[in-house]
Amino acid sequence: SGTTNTVAAYNLTWKSTNFKTILEWEPKPINQVYTVQISTKSGDWKSKCFYTADTECDLTDEIVKDVKQTYLARVFSYPAGHVESTGSTEEPPYENSPEFTPYLETNLGQPTIQSFEQVGTKVNVTVQDEWTLVRRNDTFLSLRDVFGKDLIYTLYYWKSSSSGKKTAKTNTNEFLIDVDKGENYCFSVQAVIPSRRTANRKSTDSPVECMGHEKGESRE
């Protein structure tokens, strides 16, 4: 038969950061290829990554159509060299993925401090707003556009001469903090979605930026 000696995929795993979403699976193919299908709970199946020898498939284009929907994918296994034939009725072996809701489950990418500016005893720290592949009216949306006030940034800031980290929070991408005059400070930010309860609640910390380096500006 057309699907003899093919092995069903297993360990189907969603890898998603800032909505860039890839489905990964095993095993590495030996004399077989894969095709992926994706659908919403109520929608039709759409095929992607036709007859690929890869063990991953970028599904970003599909999930960004509605990031609040829940998606299911499945991976079909075919013999290597398989050509679709209209007469074939035998369904190839396949495995279903876990359900995936991008809005709830995509990981938050590492944020970046765009700039900081000191005016007297105040410092304005700006977090770079990352672009995503989510679109609205043919315009790409930023992370802030997608998550709105659900996305919080926590700023950690400390005197270069000390270890204790003060914190500030914002539901925009800007912080305005009080600092001691004549002191140099370092900054790091973390993205948080407080409504989440799992591992994807927080991003990794941004690279540390310190006053006296090129990102900063100081005015009396």
């Epitope: 919080i152 926590t154 950690y156 270890s163 204790g164 980290k165 003060k166 914190t167 500030a168 929070k169 914002t170 539901n171 903090i177 009080d178 790091s188 973390q190 948080v192 407080p194 309860r197 799992t198 591992a199 609640r201 927080k202 910390d205």
Partner: antibody, heavy 120, light 107 residues
Framework: EVQLVESGGGLVQPGGSLRLSCAAS????????IHWVRQAPGKGLEWVGY????????YYADSVKGRFTISADTSKNTAYLQMNSLRAEDTAVYYC?????????????WGQGTLVTVSS | DIQMTQSPSSLSASVGDRVTITCRAS??????VAWYQQKPGKAPKLLIY???FLYSGVPSRFSGSRSGTDFTLTISSLQPEDFATYYC?????????FGQGTKVEIK
């Protein structure tokens, strides 16, 4: 069910040391911030310090800076308060509390507290 | 550090009374204020967060409001289980600071 359980309190002499534990269940401490708060007998609440277990960042109240150290072991889902050079004025019930890291960061869950008595 | 000045330090009231407790922040704290209830020998419990949001499971007779740097906790109709000490707390900046507490006693 979210729970925080403190342990390790007791009677200690001035100048002595004590390590308090805060064991969390029902959530993973690495995704939150953990604070220590104390309450002297008949007095109000005093914030002691915090740790973000995801990066190890800490900050302390001036009254304990240099004497107390907060740490966390994410594999044990437990935070710790190491108290050195204890003074009579450190006598209090010590609570750990979870900070949900939202914009207003309320302490949404608290432990039952553990009593530390510093006396000779 | 930001000071949270809470008043009154104690009050006597009867079941059914409307009770108001206020907290004044020494500088702007936006809405980053929470209110807690504490009973003797027990840990504090969160009542109100973000100045005016009722925490899950808290009876609707509790409410919070903000006017500039003044924050108010109101109990619309005091119940027997509400006799306790109440604390405000700001978490706008580190260190977070508490008010001195208000003990609500039975008249």
């Amino acid at each position: 069910e979210v729970q925080l359980v403190e342990s390790g309190g007791g009677l200690v002499q001035p100048g002595g040391s004590l390590r308090l534990s805060c064991a969390a269940s029902g959530f993973t401490i690495a995704y939150y911030i953990i604070h220590w708060v104390r309450q002297a007998p008949g007095k109000g609440l005093e914030w002691v310090g915090y740790i973000d277990p995801s990066n190890g960042y800490t900050y302390y109240a001036d009254s304990v800076k240099g004497r107390f150290t907060i740490s966390a072991d994410t594999s044990k889902n437990t935070a710790y308060l190491q108290m050195n050079s204890l003074r009579a004025e450190d006598t209090a019930v010590y609570y750990c509390a979870r900070d949900d890291q939202s914009l207003s960061s309320p302490f949404d869950y608290w432990g039952q507290g553990t009593l530390v008595t510093v006396s000779s | 550090d930001i000071q949270m000045t809470q008043s009154p330090s104690s009050l006597s009231a009867s079941v059914g009374d409307r009770v108001t407790i206020t907290c004044r922040a020494s500088q702007d704290v936006n809405t980053a204020v929470a209110w807690y209830q504490q009973k003797p020998g027990k840990a504090p419990k969160l009542l109100i967060y973000s100045a005016s949001f009722l925490y899950s499971g808290v009876p609707s007779r509790f409410s919070g409001s903000r006017s500039g740097t003044d924050f108010t906790l109101t109990i619309s109709s005091l119940q027997p289980e509400d006799f306790a000490t109440y604390y405000c707390q700001q978490h706008y900046t580190t260190p977070p600071t508490f008010g001195q507490g208000t003990k609500v006693e039975i008249k």
